[in-house]
Interface confidence: medium
């Protein structure tokens, strides 16, 4: 028997520095977790103790903090090189700055293979990107070889900016021939490493013949065997065992997100490459694990110029941006309109001639807006200003919901109106009318939504049985502020870009902004 240790990360999202327990900015260092310096300490410890170790990343290193805003992926290449990753799969967020923003900082600079079998380049891009990412890679590990085959969410064109010269194929259809090729090369230990979410990971384990282990990402799935060490609630045991169509037991793993855990899976293979046993658990990277001093020093060096970024002008406002709780928790506020407009603008993807855009709606809990911005400071808006408005380090995500769920959400928005509670929704691409004289749960008297399958966008009544795409904060997607119906009834959830980054990009693009209160939210006469 031959034993392999798989160390894995996914959805790190630019958390190069240690973070608080909820993966936001580290405040009290003695309670902080993760970060590449701490990760390196643990990885090196395991490399010294065990003979056959692979360090893998399942995508979405890009996007999430000011590190990515400034360094655009160069920080990913540098620190992944320093940690000596063995392979990485492409995630959807790796395309956030277009193909060029992937090729230059990461693909050309990475000293490890970057993989995806289901992304095919065409046209002029084919020769430009040739060899910079691969469908699979055979890695020598000790006296053996291990094949790693990559995959990426086929939804990427709707979630990011891969352009028109990359085709995202069905994962299972694309993976099978590559695995077959590895078999003909006498590679009998094969890991599928990819970024399509836990459901697809399980399908790959079930359907792709010859895959021994699946290491996934995208859904931020936390798996754990035994008592979990922090706040995350396990979605299943680690590893999650799937019985394949040809009768094999295939371990599937994922390691939550944000570099908080290091996935740790031990696999025993027989001489024919069959998995005999698999066991392990994610390792919580808490403060009991010291940060490696050399990597920490390197982090501090790269930081020098980040601090200055926060105070630089992104653009100007010529109006007061009312982000006060007195406004945003009671009525339409122009800060809410600005943020929602930025959220929609960030998700413009013209992927189908029938649709002007794939999504037109935004909802945003008023309690998530934490500060106004005064235009009398020469109109200047800085990252620092936006960090006061959106201090929680969240993301603006894409969900699919039925109309009936949206209706429930808007009823919840005003079910206890008047108490300055955070669930009052700010909107974009939605016109809502409330009648507060009616009883809670029956206060939404009009709910019109902007069409997407139209050449001239207009507002139509919400249809209860129709499925709609909506951009919203991850906080709401996870059921925050009492929006349990969103969490329980959502049909799809894809994590998006860092909230501040979305708004800062929009302001930089617009240069001068003047959001108004324009009747998106109304109260019927006599009730307000």
């Amino acid at each position: 028997a031959w034993e392999l240790t798989i160390l894995h990360t996914n959805d790190v999202h630019s958390r190069l520095e240690q973070t608080s327990e909820d993966s936001s900015k580290c405040v009290n260092a003695s309670r902080c977790m993760g970060g590449v310096a701490r990760l390196f300490t643990k990885v090196q410890q395991i490399r010294r103790a065990e003979p056959n170790v692979l360090l893998l990343d399942a995508g979405d290193q890009y996007q999430g903090t000011i590190w990515f805003t400034v360094y655009k992926g160069a920080e990913v290449a540098h620190f992944m090189n320093a940690l000596r990753y063995d392979a990485m799969a492409l995630g959807n967020h790796e395309f956030d700055n277009g193909v060029e923003g992937l090729i230059e900082p990461l693909l050309k600079e990475a000293k490890f293979p970057i993989l995806s079998a289901n992304i095919k380049a065409k046209g002029p891009l084919a020769s430009q990107i040739s060899g910079l990412y691969l469908p699979y890679k055979v890695l020598p590990v000790g006296d053996e070889v291990v094949g790693i085959v990559g995959y990426t969410s086929k939804e990427t064109p709707f979630l990011s900016n891969p352009g028109t010269n990359l085709v995202f194929e069905d994962e299972i259809t694309a993976l099978q021939p590559e695995v077959d090729k590895l078999k003909t090369l006498n590679v009998n230990k094969i890991i599928a490493l990819g970024h399509s979410g836990f459901e697809m990971d399980k399908l790959i384990a079930q359907k792709v013949r010859g895959v021994d282990v699946v290491v996934g990402g995208h859904s931020n799935t936390f798996l754990y065997t035994g008592n979990p060490p922090s706040k995350e609630v396990p979605a299943g045991k680690y590893p999650f065992i799937v019985t394949s169509d040809d009768g094999r037991k295939v371990p599937v793993v994922q390691a939550y997100a944000f570099g908080k855990y290091l996935g740790y899976l031990k696999i025993e293979f027989d001489e024919r490459g069959n998995v005999i046993s698999s066991h392990g658990n994610p390792i919580l990277l808490n403060s009991s694990i010291p940060e490696d001093p050399s990597i920490k020093a390197d982090i501090n060096k790269w930081r020098i110029k980040l601090d200055n970024y926060s105070t630089q002008e992104l653009g100007k406002t010529i109006v007061y941006l009312d982000g006060s709780s007195q406004s945003c928790r009671f009525r339409e506020c122009n800060m809410g309109n600005l943020i929602c407009d930025a959220m929609i603008n960030n998700n413009l993807r013209h992927t189908d001639e029938m649709f002007w855009n794939h999504v037109s709606m935004c909802i945003l809990n008023g309690g998530g807006i934490r500060s106004p911005i005064d235009e009398r400071n020469n109109g200047t808006i800085t990252w620092e200003n936006l960090a006061a408005v959106l201090p929680f380090g969240g993301t603006f995500d894409l969900v699919q919901l039925k109309g009936s769920t949206l209706k429930k959400a808007f009823e919840h928005s005003v079910h206890r109106y008047g108490q300055s509670t955070g669930e009052f929704l700010q909107v974009g691409g939605i016109h809502v009318v409330y009648d507060l004289s009616r009883k809670p749960g029956d206060r939404v008297v009009k709910l019109d939504v902007l069409c997407t399958k139209c050449r001239v966008p207009s507002y139509d009544p919400l249809k209860m049985d129709e499925v709609y795409k909506v951009i919203l904060p991850n906080f709401l997607a996870n059921g925050g502020d009492g929006f349990q119906m969103i969490k329980d009834e959502l049909l799809r959830h894809d994590s998006g870009d860092q909230d501040i980054n979305v708004v800062s990009t929009y302001i930089s693009k617009m240069k001068v902004i003047y959001p108004a209160v324009e009747g998106r939210i109304k109260f019927s006469t006599g009730s307000h």
Epitope: A297, N300, N308
Partner: antibody
Framework: QVQLVQSGAEVEKPGASVKVSCKAS????????ITWVRQAPGQGLEWMGD????????NYNEKFKTRVTITADKSTSTAYMELSSLRSEDTAVYYC???????????????WGQGTLVTV | AIQLTQSPSSLSASVGDRVTITCRAS??????????MHWYQQKPGQAPRLLIY???NLESGVPSRFSGSGSGTDFTFTISSLEAEDAATYYC?????????FGQGTKVEIK
């Protein structure tokens, strides 16, 4: 090999503006900071500011903040430094330089352009 | 801004001499085990050339007679055995915080 090639000498009148270019080759332009440094005749080196071409992020020396604009064009791997409201004391050689980056982010200036003499 | 003071401002030495230049910072430029001090050589009519980075690391292609040391606020640049081609002005520069500043320079002449 890494090269930074700057535009030619300029003679400008007081109050005018000057824009100096710096074309980079031989490395990934978007992944390293470009710094601008000037040197008046017979004087020392003065750090003016820098740009990260990957994001367009800039930092300026307070002394020049209101008059200098540093930009970068990723498509041509060219950085620019524009200085406005020129006065006689701006007569100097203006250098662009590449900062160390991916191997050690120490911000030492490891490659320099040949310099552009601006006479006001 | 951090001020850097070089001394001496000029010196004259013979070929084969050991030459030492010091650079004092008005504030610590060391942290996390790194000292953000660099040394450059500039010959008349030429652009500066990086010799030493992070206080003591020799840039590739630079002769080993050049060296640097120091931490905190006090740094030293040494030419162990002066050669005729070393006649130039030498500058220290810090990159600990913005703005990055240079010392005023030390002119080295050959006797």
């Amino acid at each position: 090999q890494v090269q930074l090639v700057q535009s030619g000498a300029e003679v400008e009148k007081p109050g005018a503006s000057v824009k100096v270019s710096c074309k980079a080759s031989g490395y990934t332009f978007t992944s390293y900071w470009i710094t601008w440094v000037r040197q008046a005749p017979g004087q020392g080196l003065e750090w003016m500011g820098d740009i990260y071409p990957g994001s367009g992020n800039t930092n300026y020396n307070e002394k020049f903040k209101t008059r200098v604009t540093i930009t970068a064009d990723k498509s041509t791997s060219t950085a620019y430094m524009e200085l406005s409201s020129l006065r006689s004391e701006d007569t100097a050689v203006y250098y662009c330089a590449k900062e160390g980056g991916l191997t050690t982010e120490d911000y030492a200036l490891d490659y320099w352009g040949q310099g552009t003499l601006v006479t006001v | 801004a951090i001020q850097l003071t070089q001394s001496p401002s000029s010196l004259s030495a013979s070929v084969g001499d050991r030459v030492t230049i010091t650079c004092r910072a008005s504030k610590q430029v060391s942290t996390s085990g790194y000292s953000y001090m660099h040394w450059y050589q500039q010959k008349p009519g030429q652009a500066p050339r990086l010799l030493i980075y992070l206080a003591s690391n020799l840039e590739s292609g630079v002769p080993s007679r050049f060296s640097g040391s120091g931490s905190g606020t006090d740094f030293t640049f040494t030419i162990s055995s002066l050669e005729a081609e070393d006649a130039a002005t030498y500058y220290c520069q810090h990159s600990r915080e913005l703005p990055f500043t240079f010392g005023q320079g030390t002119k080295v002449e050959i006797k």
